[in-house]
């Protein structure tokens, strides 16, 4: 009986362990995707709706922080498209990227941990044009740190959630 | 303010060419896209082309493809459409638009052409 | 290639009237539809953009509605300088117009 008593009780340290394991997967925020064709950073993102999902991590200022230090899988998977309904592109050469960068506040530095993209021909006989661009990656990160996601040519996001995310979760403590 | 000013009206026989001007001012003529519409006697409006006036890229309908050139001067602020081969169903007055989309926080161009020329009328007939 | 179609082609209304029209898309464009007017002898002007916004310095009596492929061009209140007429666009598709005319 002990033995049981023993059993349930580690069964349930490692389940509210894995309850506590910080994860975010958060969705595009559709109303509020910057124009332009440069590169900037993308601060609308939803962590409560749909599939968008948060615990024991803080979404802040559009970037996603870590509050627990620890060994994480980053991803990003970044939609890009354009129909012809919405007008033509000014321009049919474009570089098509996403950027995901690790900003320290407590060393002030960044750093860009992954990025993909290619350089797309998208010619103006073409009713519709689609690319994604998915990066994942296994990294280090404290407490503190803050994660952010950056694209070319935001205004050719696909806003749909099941379209342009991004999120993390924590996989191992770091020993 | 922002003001599009075409050149006057022209008469052209059947065969030849035509190229009217439209220069703009009261805002950065490189930043837009400027477009090119008519309007025969008792037709409807008739979408010719466009021209960034940033980096010369154009595109036209597959109506005037081939008859059509535009161009632009960016220090004179001046963009010009050439038609060739003019027949009398070329008359029409022909109107230069500025595309709503800033070229420096668009991609697009929109096809909301929120100024215009006052028109130019062309006259086809031998 | 998407075609629009106007109603009705043209008519009379009073002063004070109400005055709606119609612009029909052959197939679905969203929300990407614009209204001119268009005077003779004059540079035609942007009322909408995007179905129903309204163009800096246009009168709040014209508003636009719709979307997918029905939409609607209103004058809650002619006045006789709306005497002109009026197109509906998609990218390069215009429609063939209407006249409003004051009875």
């Known amino acids: 009986e002990k033995a049981m008593v023993d059993g349930s009780w580690l069964d349930l340290a490692k389940r509210s362990k894995l309850e506590a394991q910080p994860f975010a997967h958060l969705t595009i925020n559709a109303t509020d995707i910057p124009s332009g064709s440069h590169k900037v950073s993308l601060s609308s993102w939803y962590h409560d709706r749909g599939w968008a999902k948060i615990s024991n991590m803080t979404f802040s200022n559009g970037k996603l922080i870590v509050n627990q230090d620890g060994f994480y899988y980053l991803y990003a998977n970044i939609c890009f498209r354009h129909h012809e309904t919405s007008g033509d592109l000014a321009t049919e050469y474009l570089q098509l990227m996403v950027y995901v960068t690790k900003t320290s506040i407590k060393i002030p530095s960044s750093h860009t941990l992954m990025k993909g993209g290619s350089t797309k021909y998208w010619s103006g006989n073409s009713e519709f044009h689609f690319y994604s661009i998915n990066v994942g990656g296994f990294f280090k990160l404290r407490s503190g740190e803050e994660i952010s996601i950056e694209v070319s040519n935001p205004s050719l996001l696909d806003p749909d959630q099941d379209a342009t995310y991004f999120g993390a979760f924590k996989v191992r403590d770091i020993d | 303010q922002v003001q599009l000013v075409q050149s006057g009206a022209e008469v052209r026989k059947p065969g030849a060419s035509v190229k009217v001007s439209c220069k703009a001012s009261?805002?950065?003529?490189?930043?837009?896209?400027i477009h090119w519409v008519r309007q025969a006697p008792g037709q409807r409006l008739e979408w010719m082309g466009w021209?960034?006036?940033?980096?010369?890229?154009?595109k036209f309908s597959q109506k005037f493809q081939g008859r059509i050139t535009v161009t632009r001067d960016t220090a004179a602020s001046t963009a010009y459409m050439e038609l060739r081969s003019l027949r009398s169903e070329d008359t029409a007055v022909y109107y230069c638009a500025r595309d709503s989309s800033n070229m420096v926080r668009a991609i697009i161009i929109a096809y909301y052409f929120d100024y215009w020329g006052q028109g130019t009328l062309v006259t086809v007939s031998s | 290639e998407i075609v629009m179609t106007q109603s009705p082609s043209s008519l009379s209304a009073s002063v004070g009237d109400r005055v709606t029209i119609t612009c029909r898309a052959s197939q679905s464009i969203s929300r990407y539809l614009n209204w001119y007017q268009l005077k003779p002898g004059k540079a035609p002007r942007l009322l909408i953009y995007?179905?129903?916004s309204l163009q800096s310095g246009v009168p709040s009596r014209f508003s636009g509605s719709g979307s997918g492929a029905e939409f609607t061009l209103t004058i809650s209140s002619l006045q006789p300088e709306d005497i002109a007429t009026y197109y509906c666009?998609?990218?390069?598709?215009f429609g063939q117009g209407t006249k409003v005319e004051i009875k």
């Open positions: 995007g179905a129903s």
């Open positions: 666009q998609h990218t390069r598709a």
């Open positions: 009261g805002y950065d003529f490189s930043n837009y896209a």
């Open positions: 021209i960034n006036a940033g980096n010369g890229n154009t």
